[in-house]
Interface confidence: low
């Protein structure tokens, strides 16, 4: 296991006294109920805590809630329930916090049965003051802020009306009826689906997709026979019912729905689903469910147009529509994703890609770990990561994998070491190089969080017993110190730190229970005195990301460029600070054939990097050929991988072919063969 508090670990001096002076307890005079916590703004120190308690009476349930506010990262809280007139707040809508640092907050209140509409409380000063507003409708969903303008809100009503406010919820206008789903796009555009006949459920597959670019003054129908739609990066996706049967296909638009292209993906039947796993402005990862109740499907990665897809990973675990998948974007290193596959023997195995889905491999076995009972060969096995699926299966996994963009290379996750995921109690593993190598960090399940951009990692053991000890590491999980933060153990419910991992404060939430009472309590610990000084130049070292072969001058080239980072030395105990910016130096690589994907109608034979023309088009390739737009059917066989920045090197220039000539089928009439999807 990873070294603990032993000789080789340089202990932080006098840390008990330093932490004791910076540990702040707050007892909430609430019966237990439930608690929800939201950060308002970035680096503001403002936290809102909503406690709710349901008292079951004979006829109905009486709800009571309290609102607390902190402006010092949770060290002190003030009861501000009177600012919302002691109203009961509906927790299913949560606290709707405005984008960026707008300081806006919307709370949705519970109102009595016969009222004309709902009620909200609005704040635009980081919850210092609230304004009560009665709504002309009963909200079905949480208020949604426009990403571009936090004064613009939209909501769906229980009557399926689409309501918009242009003045941060002061006045509301119903802009459309019979709406199933609505989403903000870019430039304050709203996309929504409507039904014509009975209801959203009854009309599924016969919905219309509408767009308004002026908050409801004018509308354009941009799609018909719609099953559902989604937004990802600069792509707008719609699943559209086929003419002849109950199957549906994905169509893609990159111009807000003005024009559509059929995606070269398999069609799916009634019981199947599509899911956008991840998307950015360059490309999308799309999961396509297998027929039947298999619990798996295939991951496809798109080209830069979202039209041509390459098969990325087979047997990808994804249980049911809206079910569980372990797909995780490792945000601490570009191009890295982790997920699970369901193998032929029904065991679950973890796979990782370092090149945005181009190639998947097993995770390397941690050096300091033995292979468990799932391993056939005790010397050869892999690390398998527990994520959403394990949590849903009630395995002893308190947290999903964790990574932060500003804690470069660090990934923390529960896992087991063997041939597949084990149901045994997992341990916690850490990678400091974005998933290439792993080390056992902590024995047994823990809650964990990253502070000060990776300068501190904090963990608490997952236990059914009350706890009073927190562990922390200043060297990326190699060595750990323990600190007793209270004499009286608490039933632990969660760790909270400000999103973005820049803070040095951690809040430990839990409750105390005695014979008659139960109370919420939080302990906020500030680590600023542990990291006594600001980091200097000498505290950082140069690290080449994706380095696997230092002798190779193309070492680190991923998606056409390599990046060198300045990273904090493990031995340095200092503050990165709230203003820390990741320092990276990119350099362009020469192009190889691996920087190109095969365009429509081409494929890569095994162990070859050249794209070869498909001898005949079958299945969904043929459908794409028949219905795809003509300009997408002329190609030289290669297309640069989305986001790939390589220059020079190989430029796979070859004759441009018109694949329309290959589009033939006995099942479709000639006039259909020239039709463009529109």
């Amino acid at each position: 296991s990873a070294p603990g508090e032993d000789e080789e670990c340089g202990r932080v001096r006098d840390f008990v006294a330093k932490l004791a002076n910076n540990t702040h307890q707050h007892v909430f005079d609430d019966a237990r109920g439930s608690v929800s916590l939201s950060w308002v703004g970035d680096s503001t120190g403002v936290i809102l805590v909503l406690t709710t308690f349901h008292v079951p009476l004979v006829i109905m349930t009486f709800g009571q809630s309290k609102l607390y506010r902190s402006e010092d990262y949770g060290k002190n809280f003030k009861d501000i329930t009177d600012l919302i007139n002691n109203t009961f707040i509906r927790t299913e809508f949560g606290m709707a916090i405005g984008p960026e640092n707008s300081g806006k907050v919307v709370l949705t209140a519970e109102v009595s049965g016969g009222s004309r509409g709902g009620r909200i409380f609005r704040s635009s000063d980081f919850a210092k003051n609230f304004v009560q507003t009665d709504l002309p409708f009963h909200p079905l969903t949480q208020m949604m802020y426009s990403p571009q303008n936090s004064d613009y809100l939209l909501a769906l009503s229980t009557e399926n009306g689409l309501w918009v406010s242009k003045n941060f919820g002061g006045k509301w206008e119903e802009i459309h009826k019979a709406v199933c789903l609505a989403k903000w796009g870019s430039d304050n555009t709203i996309f929504f689906t409507t039904y014509a006949n009975g209801s959203c459920k009854a009309d599924l597959g016969a919905l219309e997709l509408w767009r308004t670019s002026d908050l409801g003054k004018s509308f354009k129908t941009i799609g018909v026979k719609i099953y559902s739609f989604g937004l990802g990066g600069r792509f707008l996706f719609a699943s559209v019912m086929a003419d002849k049967d109950t199957t549906r296909r994905i169509h893609v638009s990159t111009d807000q729905g003005d024009t559509w292209s059929m995606a070269q993906l398999p069609s799916v039947g009634q019981e199947q689903f599509y899911s956008i796993l991840a998307a950015n402005d360059d490309m999308v990862f799309m999961h396509v469910d297998e027929p039947g109740d298999t619990g798996f499907g295939t991951i496809f990665t798109s080209d830069d147009r979202g039209i041509v897809y390459s098969k990325s990973l087979d047997r990808h675990l994804y249980t049911t529509t809206g079910g569980e998948t372990d797909f995780t974007n490792v945000t601490s290193l570009r191009g890295v994703y982790i997920t699970s596959v369901l193998s032929e023997d029904n065991s679950i195995q973890t796979m990782i890609t370092f090149d945005q889905g181009g190639r998947w491999t097993h995770l390397r076995k941690p050096e300091n770990s033995e292979c468990d009972a799932t391993a056939k060969n005790k010397n050869e096995c892999s690390l398998h990561i527990h994520a959403s699926y394990s949590i849903s299966q009630k395995l002893n996994v308190p947290m999903a994998p964790l990574s932060e963009p500003n804690a470069v290379g660090i990934v923390i996750a529960h896992g087991s070491v063997g041939d597949a995921i084990s149901v045994m109690v997992p341990d916690v593993y850490i990678s400091d190089d974005g998933g290439y190598s792993w080390t056992k960090m902590l024995e047994g399940p823990h809650y964990y969080t990253i502070l000060d951009s990776g300068g501190i990692i904090v963990a608490i053991e997952h236990s059914s017993r009350p706890i009073n000890v927190i562990k922390f590491s200043t060297d990326e999980g190699q060595c750990w110190q323990t600190y007793t933060f209270t004499r009286d153990p608490i039933y632990f419910t969660g760790l909270a730190s400000e999103p973005g991992a820049r803070s040095m404060n951690i809040s430990i939430w839990g409750f105390t229970e005695s014979f008659l009472t139960s109370q919420w309590v939080s302990y906020t610990i500030d680590f600023k005195d542990i990291l006594e000084r600001n980091c200097e130049e000498k505290d950082y070292t140069i690290w080449l990301a994706h380095s696997t072969d230092p002798e190779d001058y193309e070492d680190g080239c991923i998606l056409g460029y390599k990046e060198q980072f300045l990273r904090l030395r493990k031995s340095s105990v200092c503050q990165n600070g709230r203003d820390y910016v990741v320092t990276k130096q990119p350099s362009i690589c020469l192009c190889s054939l691996e920087d190109f994907l095969c365009d429509f109608g081409y494929y890569r034979p095994e162990n070859d990097s050249k794209c070869v023309e498909q001898p005949e088009l079958k299945g969904h390739d043929l459908e794409f050929c028949l219905y795809g737009r003509e300009e997408h059917l002329t190609t030289n066989g290669y297309r640069k991988i989305p986001g790939d920045k390589c220059q020079g090197g190989v430029n796979p220039v070859r004759e441009v072919k018109d694949l329309k000539k290959k589009c033939t089928s006995n099942f479709l009439s000639p006039e259909k063969q020239n039709s463009k999807s529109n």
């Epitope: 002798e551 193309e554 350099s587 162990n607 990097s609 020079g648 190989v650």
Partner: antibody
Framework: QVQLVQSGAEVKKPGASVKVSCKAS????????MSWVRQAPGQGLEWMGI????????SYAQKFQGRVTMTRDTSTSTVYMELSSLRSEDTAVYYC??????????????????????WGQGTTVTVSS | EIVMTQSPATLSVSPGERATLSCRAS??????LAWYQQKPGQAPRLLIY???TRATGIPARFSGSGSGTEFTLTISSLQSEDFAVYYC?????????FGGGTKVEIK
Amino acid sequence: QVQLVQSGAEVKKPGASVKVSCKASGYTFTSRYMSWVRQAPGQGLEWMGIINPVGGSTSYAQKFQGRVTMTRDTSTSTVYMELSSLRSEDTAVYYCARDPSGIAAAGPASRYYYGMDVWGQGTTVTVSS
Amino acid sequence: EIVMTQSPATLSVSPGERATLSCRASQSVSSNLAWYQQKPGQAPRLLIYGASTRATGIPARFSGSGSGTEFTLTISSLQSEDFAVYYCQQARLGPWTFGGGTKVEIK
């Protein structure tokens, strides 16, 4: 046609520096790395280092680290190799060679090496007091 | 660094005969190996790349084989213009390294 033309012969005193140029023509200059190889009289070939014309990044053999500097000028499609602190054992013919290293792949896991396919005519550097 | 060892140092062969040259790497270089021919007063010329692929314009009598650590260059029927020094070179790990060379001379 593709060719590499090197600068003329040089005679230098010990401790001095020499800068050899290599002008590329007949292909896109930024599409290939350039290696430098030297050959002492009656000896074998010795690789000195490589430069990526796109960004100018370099990789030098340990033996020459600190003494050799490779640069490029994309506007003239020319690479340069400068060797400092010359000693008599640096007397050799210095070649530039187009090196497509690693620019194509032979399948999932391995790079494919295309070899140094075009060589300059060589520049003789004599170090003598 | 990877050490490349060529044998024999000198090979005496009659015109029309077959010549077999060996090259051994101190560790695996996969198939990242090239063969060059050099005649007196000339720059080296690429013969074989990727351990076994003939470069453009190279006659079919030259062939390369092997992978990992053991490689062979075969000249099936020596012509008068083939008498020269032959070098192998690895490009698996930096620094690129050459073998010491095999001189093919007329017997």
